[in-house]
């Protein structure tokens, strides 16, 4: 297709000059452009008391182009609209209005919500999560050995974050009690001693019901060595308490 377009030329005025500026096809010294070259829009510009014809490559903001056989005109968008393809198809609304299907609305229709960033009415988006991933190995304080009760965790991903009015996401982490596989810990695999063995607080995302109580995790089947460790721990705890009490009385 060729870029050139046919336009019926307007009848020549007595004061029409041949050396037209810019995109003018015909013009006069007094009125400026009288007609435009193909693909250009004719608009009137007010200069003082006088209106001058100008030819524009595109219509200014707030106006849209209309084609006629002999002229292309710029026409104003509706009052509530900043940019448009025509009066019935707005593409950007003025401040305080929301765009929906080419119209500018004060409030969004039922079932839609206002996006204050894009100033559009958008569909309410509900949270979507993936299927659960497999359960993690059963561990007790990071160890997968030692004939103890432990915990296992599984996670799932958020596929679609919800919009402001959408349904919130369900938990994405789940932890439950389990039995650590029955095998003796190798050297260096034993649990840490003393205060270091205190359980880390669970993450916010973990479901309460699935978070195990540290007491209930203690297994009745213990190796003598581990029982000794426990007694030492108890002693240390008592000592620690006494220390903290004595410290607190200083204040």
């Amino acid at each position: 297709q060729n870029a050139s377009r046919g336009r019926r030329q307007r009848r020549m005025h007595p004061n029409v000059s041949q050396g037209c500026q810019g995109g003018c096809a015909t013009c006069s010294d007094y009125n400026g452009c009288l007609s435009c070259k193909p693909r250009l829009f004719f608009a009137l510009e007010r200069i003082g008391m006088k209106q001058i014809g100008v030819c524009l490559s595109s219509c200014p903001s707030g106006y849209y182009g209309t084609r006629y056989p002999d002229i292309n005109k710029c026409t104003k968008c509706k009052a509530d609209c900043d940019t448009c393809f025509n009066k019935n198809f707005c593409t950007k609304c003025k401040s305080g209005f929301y765009l929906h299907l080419g119209k500018c609305l004060d409030n969004c229709p039922e079932g839609l919500e206002a996006n204050n960033h894009t100033m559009e009415c958008v569909s309410i988006v509900h949270c979507e999560v993936s299927e659960w991933n497999p359960w993690s190995p059963c561990t007790k304080k990071g160890k997968t050995c030692g004939f103890k009760r432990g915990t296992e965790t599984r996670v799932r991903e958020i596929i679609q974050h919800p919009s402001a009015k959408g349904n919130l996401c369900p938990p994405t982490n789940e932890t439950r009690k389990c039995t650590v596989q029955r095998k003796k810990c190798q050297k260096g695999e034993r649990g840490k001693k003393g205060r270091e063995r205190k359980r880390k607080k669970p993450n916010k995302g973990e479901s309460k019901e699935a978070i195990p109580d540290s007491k209930s995790l203690e297994s009745s089947k213990e190796i003598p060595e581990q029982r000794e460790n426990k007694q030492q721990q108890k002693k240390r705890k008592v000592q620690d308490k006494q220390k903290s009490v004595s410290v607190s009385t200083v204040h």
Epitope: A3, S58, Y64, R67, F85, N86, K87
Partner: antibody, heavy 117, light 111 residues
Framework: QVQLVQSGAEVKKPGASVKVSCKAS????????IHWVRQAPGQGLEWIGY????????GYNQKFKNRVTMTRDTSTSTAYMELSRLRSEDTAVYYC??????????WGQGTTLTVSS | DIVLTQSPASLAVSLGQRATITCKAS??????????MNWYQQKPGQPPKLLIY???NLESGIPARFSGSGSGTDFTLTINPVEAEDVATYYC?????????FGAGTKLELK
């Protein structure tokens, strides 16, 4: 002479994304909005949406709203249309077109997209 | 959405005869005295080509045997006389409202 030259044919698997380009020449790229229209095999024409190259503002047919993104690069006078989460029904010829005073007056040659597993 | 119903779906016309294609909109596509209806011609393997804009205006470079008429909801594309090169599919398209929509097309063949 106004010309819109589109990128070559694409074959994609369901769930994947595709990005089609449309390079404009012969006019000032920022003067007119660029629209995208598709045509499934043996079917009619379906409007996808538009972009204003001057400021990057875009608008989409509600049907495609959550899957389509239109962008542009004014330095190369190129418009892009990205369609995500592809399904077999997206198999079609995708056209870009300039929109001049409420009609599509210049069209790209089309980009064939085949979505198949 | 504005639905455009084209009829007939296909049409066989003898060379030199008149071909008439109609397009009915589900609601008016007029505003401020302008009709936002366009007609396109598409040949196999090619993009569509603008024939008529604003219901009745002939696009530059298009032969005068093509003409458009109508307003509101009822529009007509006429080809008179039909020539061999006119074998194609013809689409009406409204640009009055979002989303822009096309008719399903009318396939013109020679008898």
């Amino acid at each position: 002479q106004v010309q819109l030259v589109q990128s070559g044919a694409e074959v994609k698997k369901p769930g994947a994304s595709v990005k089609v380009s449309c390079k404009a020449s012969g006019y000032t790229f920022t003067d007119y909005s660029i629209h995208w229209v598709r045509q499934a095999p043996g079917q009619g024409l379906e409007w996808i949406g538009y972009i204003y190259p001057s400021n990057g503002d875009s608008g989409y047919n509600q049907k495609f709203k959550n899957r389509v993104t239109m962008t542009r690069d004014t330095s190369t006078s190129t418009a892009y249309m990205e369609l995500s989460r592809l399904r077999s029904e997206d198999t079609a010829v995708y056209y870009c077109a300039t929109y001049f005073a409420n009609n599509f007056d210049y069209w790209g040659q089309g980009t064939t997209l085949t979505v198949s597993s | 959405d504005i639905v455009l119903t084209q009829s007939p779906a296909s049409l066989a016309v003898s060379l030199g005869q008149r071909a008439t294609i109609t397009c009915k909109a589900s609601q008016s596509v007029d505003y401020d005295g302008d009709s936002y209806m366009n007609w396109y011609q598409q040949k196999p393997g090619q993009p569509p080509k603008l024939l008529i804009y604003a219901a009745s205006n002939l696009e530059s470079g298009i032969p005068a045997r093509f003409s458009g008429s109508g307003s509101g909801t009822d529009f007509t594309l006429t080809i008179n006389p039909v020539e061999a090169e006119d074998v194609a599919t013809y689409y009406c398209q409204q640009s009055n409202e979002d989303p822009l929509t096309f008719g399903a097309g009318t396939k013109l063949e020679l008898k």
